[in-house]
């Protein structure tokens, strides 16, 4: 197996911040879901992964490795560009594929070398190697020389939560199964919380029996189910009391911006 | 019930090859539902993840940086085993060495050890 | 590598009273869903070591329920709810969040 390529991070431009929120700590907040977020850590000079907990926090907190790089280092944006030109395609776009250790049942895409493609193929849920993207948007980004691109491929992506694909320790567990929406759930615009409380139970893809609760939005409660270890979405909790904490306040109106408290 | 047992020479001189062999029964090598490692302890550095195999579509396998150079694990489909062999051995490589099976299923962990085997590395 | 610290490294018990040991990861081993790329083993005198706690949180086959895992992001906790006798030997934690698989230095539980 070849070895993975080393961050590149240090190189990119000069290190002062870009806004004044990127120099400010990584602030979980005071509620206790575990959302997996980014911030800009200004001594490392890179962005870093922590986990929010899903209310209040600062502005040095992004979805995406990506979205807080784009907006935090200095000269990031041309550095990618030079990237997916062809001109300087990472090292990991050349690693094989590698499902990884586990075997959880996740949709993801890789660079494939031979046929010089972004292609999907099923990722195990732990470990593996960095050629291993959440998006096929985001691998042909990042791997593709956009000479080569194929057309775009129209699948739905039900990634609400998308994390950075690149890394080794992605593990942001994509459902290829779409399950429709319930008719008695509200509609978005209606509910003012985090997106994910709005998605029906999903029990995954293993084999495991762990019980969890979801936000069941039609009812205004937080319901139990089994959870089978890996896969599903977000609208999964370990406790009723997170559950409620995270999505119950969402259908308050609320003056601080639809953040749950 | 998944039992591994381990066999080898328990005395290596300085600068020869360590070599061990973990025989599986009640699983397959070849599983698609079970990765293969091979993990060491000693006083000085406790559990020491050495590095794994497994077949999914193809074999894959990886090494701890500290011992990449010198280590290969093979599997052996025939004989339902596989192998840890560690070049040019030191007496930092004394300890007791173990494999194990990784449950790639359910449970995501270490689920099952062999025995165990001293091996001291000394002239 | 991910440094798995262990504390305390030793922890004399006694038998019916409850025993708690906690494990940090020098990175966060959560994922969103909640599951943790985190589990606990436990190495009884001259033994191998034995998978206790997979997941972060779930008891593997034929572990008696005392035993309990816990925690999120970095700050791991084994408890068990009341110490029995053969409960002695050393705890490890273990991550498999990326390679290399990293074990903590190991918590000694003996009795008092």
């Known amino acids: 197996l070849s070895e993975e390529a080393d961050d590149t991070d240090s190189e990119l431009g000069s290190m002062k911040p870009l806004h004044t929120f990127c120099a400010m700590k990584a602030d979980d907040g005071p509620c206790k879901a575990m959302i997996r977020s980014y911030f800009f850590n200004m001594y490392t000079h890179q962005c870093e992964e922590f986990i929010y907990g899903g209310c209040e926090g600062n502005e040095n907190r992004f979805d995406t490795l990506e979205e807080c790089k784009k907006t935090c280092i200095p000269g990031y944006e041309k550095t990618a560009v030079k990237a997916a030109s062809g001109a300087e395609r990472p090292d990991f776009c050349f690693l094989e594929e590698d499902p990884g250790l586990c075997r959880g049942y996740m949709k993801r895409y890789l660079y494939n070398n031979q046929t010089k493609q972004c292609e999907r193929f099923v990722y195990g849920g732990c470990l593996g190697n960095r050629n291993n993207f959440e998006t096929l948007d985001e691998c042909k980004k990042i791997c593709e020389n956009p000479v080569h691109s194929p057309s775009p491929v129209n699948e739905v992506q039900m990634s609400d939560y998308v994390t950075d694909g690149n890394t080794v320790t992605d593990r942001s567990t994509v459902n290829n199964i779409v399950v429709p929406q319930s008719p008695k759930v509200p509609r978005r615009r209606d509910y003012r919380g985090r997106p994910w409380c709005l998605q029906p139970a999903d029990s995954g893809l293993c084999k495991a029996s762990e019980r969890r609760f979801y936000y069941n939005s039609a009812t205004g409660k937080c319901h139990r189910f089994n959870y089978t270890g890996c896969g599903g979405n977000n609208n999964n909790f370990t406790t009723r009391r997170r559950c409620l904490r995270s999505c119950k306040t969402g259908l308050i109106k609320n003056k601080s911006k639809g953040v749950v408290k | 019930q998944v039992q591994l047992q381990q066999s080898g020479p328990g005395l290596v001189k300085p600068s020869q090859t360590l070599s061990l062999t973990c025989a599986i029964s009640g699983d397959s090598v070849s599983s698609n539902s079970a990765a293969w490692s091979w993990i060491r302890q000693s006083p000085g550095r406790g559990l020491e993840w050495l590095g794994i195999?497994?077949?999914?579509?193809?074999?894959?396998?990886r090494y701890a940086v500290s011992v990449k150079s010198r280590i290969t694990i093979n599997p052996d489909t025939s004989k339902n085993q596989f192998s840890l062999q560690l070049n040019s051995v030191t007496p930092e490589d004394t300890a007791v060495y173990y494999c194990?099976?990784?449950?790639?299923?359910?449970?995501?962990?270490?689920?099952?050890w062999g025995q165990g085997t001293l091996v001291t590395v000394s002239s | 590598d991910i440094v798995m610290t262990q504390s305390p490294l030793s922890l004399p018990v006694t038998p019916g009273e409850p025993a708690s040991i906690s494990c940090r990861s020098s990175q966060s081993l959560v994922f969103s869903f909640g599951i943790t790329y985190l589990n606990w083993y436990l190495q009884k005198p001259g033994q191998s070591p034995q998978l206790l706690i997979y997941?972060?949180?779930n008891r593997a086959s034929g572990v008696p329920d005392r035993f309990s895992g816990s925690g999120s992001g970095t700050d791991f906790t084994l408890k068990i709810s009341r110490v029995e006798a053969e409960d002695v030997g050393v705890y490890y934690c273990q991550q498999y969040d990326s390679y290399p698989l990293t074990f903590g230095q190991g918590t000694k539980v003996e009795i008092k």
């Open positions: 194990a099976r990784w449950h790639s299923d359910k449970m995501w962990g270490f689920d099952d």
């Open positions: 195999i497994y077949k999914r579509s193809k074999w894959y396998n």
């Open positions: 997941k972060g949180s």
